[in-house]
């Protein structure tokens, strides 16, 4: 392990489409990948009329967008599907939206997902 960096070995897993995809709906996913590459967790969700609908959560392959991010935060302004990634075991349990472009206070609070 590199000092000061959280290694990701497992992530919260969720799949809203679990029946069609023939997977579990929720659980813990061990993260695999090339041994020298970094691993991350991700979360994707939709905001439908102010209601948060989680799409998927799980492991994400080596991505410089996720380096040294301990929190899972989407910064893109008003995406169709929200996506965030982070480093550290189960770091995708909570996720939030803080658009970089906005000058005003973000309207969304950090979300603690409660899968159905």
């Amino acid at each position: 392990a590199i000092l000061g960096r959280s290694e990701t070995q497992e992530c919260l897993f969720f799949n809203a489409n679990w029946e069609k995809d023939r997977t579990n709906q929720t659980g813990v996913e061990p993260c695999y990948g090339d041994k020298d590459k970094r691993r991350h967790c991700f979360a994707t969700w939709k905001n439908i009329s102010g209601s948060i609908e989680i799409v998927k959560q799980g492991c994400w392959l080596d991505d410089i967008n996720c380096y040294d991010r301990t929190d899972c935060v989407e910064k893109k302004d008003s995406p169709e599907v929200y996506f965030c990634c982070c480093e550290g075991n189960m770091c995708n349990e909570k996720f939030s939206y803080f658009p970089e472009m906005e000058v005003t206070q973000p309207t969304s609070n950090p979300v603690t997902p409660k899968p159905p």
């Epitope: 695999y32 799409v55 998927k56 799980g58 994400w60 991505d63 410089i64 995406p79 599907v81 929200y82």
Partner: antibody, heavy 115, light 111 residues
Framework: QVQLVQSGAEVKKPGSSVKVSCKAS????????INWVRQAPGQGLEWMGT????????SYAQKFQGRVTITADTSTSTAYMELSSLRSEDTAVYYC????????WGQGTLVTVSS | QSALTQPRSVSGSPGQSVTISCTGT?????????VNWYQQHPGKAPKHMIY???KRESGVPDRFSGSKSGNTASLTISGLQAEDEADYYC???????????FGGGTKLTVL
């Protein structure tokens, strides 16, 4: 092992569209990006665009903006690249590659645009 | 984002070392460790060799090494072998907020 298998060669008329597929196996498709790159005969590599396979979010090179559409079907672990308004200069081998580091590549698909 | 600059060709004899440069700007190569190197033999798909400036892809011989100084990334191949004769491309990470760009490619001839 990780494999990206692309669809076969295509011959197209100028003005038409082409859709190339890239089927991934050996890893979880929704755990990274798929990038598309092309290479004209005797020329270098040219980045076209990328898709986040889980969110469907895309980014395209300015040169191809408005003419290229990249999609992903998570149920079949397949990414697609559609290029419209084809011209002779679009004759090239089109490659898909996994992840932001392009660590695994498809075998390439030759698209020939000719009248 | 404009293309990265590589020499058109380099050459060396078996056993020698060669270095291929890849020059960008302070806002891409200079500020981020996100340069890749690829090897491409004629008629084949590119093969990933180096990522993050200096990390070797698994299975790549340690004769291949990457480095960076200022706005220029470099690929050094030591102990040249006949099978190293190929085209080499540098390129950047692409995904999320990062847009991809490649160098023009360098033809390596083993004399």
């Amino acid at each position: 092992q990780v494999q990206l298998v692309q669809s076969g060669a295509e011959v197209k008329k100028p003005g038409s569209s082409v859709k190339v597929s890239c089927k991934a196996s050996g890893y979880k498709f929704t755990s990274s990006y798929i990038n598309w790159v092309r290479q004209a005969p005797g020329q270098g590599l040219e980045w076209m665009g990328t898709i986040n396979a889980v969110s469907g979010s895309t980014s395209y090179a300015q040169k191809f903006q408005g003419r290229v559409t990249i999609t992903a079907d998570t149920s079949t672990s397949t990414a697609y690249m559609e290029l419209s308004s084809l011209r002779s200069e679009d004759t090239a081998v089109y490659y898909c590659a996994r992840g932001g580091w392009f660590d695994y590549w498809g075998q390439g698909t030759l698209v020939t645009v000719s009248s | 984002q404009s293309a990265l600059t590589q020499p058109r060709s380099v050459s060396g004899s078996p056993g020698q070392s060669v270095t291929i440069s890849c020059t960008g700007t302070s806002s891409d190569v200079g500020s981020k460790n996100y340069v890749n190197w690829y090897q491409q033999h004629p008629g084949k798909a590119p093969k990933h060799m180096i990522y993050g400036v200096s990390k070797r892809e698994s299975g790549v011989p340690d004769r291949f090494s990457g480095s960076k100084s200022g706005n220029t990334a470099s690929l050094t191949i030591s102990g040249l072998q006949a099978e190293d004769e190929a085209d080499y491309y540098c390129g950047t990470f692409a995904g999320g907020k990062y847009y991809g760009v490649f160098g023009g490619g360098t033809k390596l001839t083993v004399l």
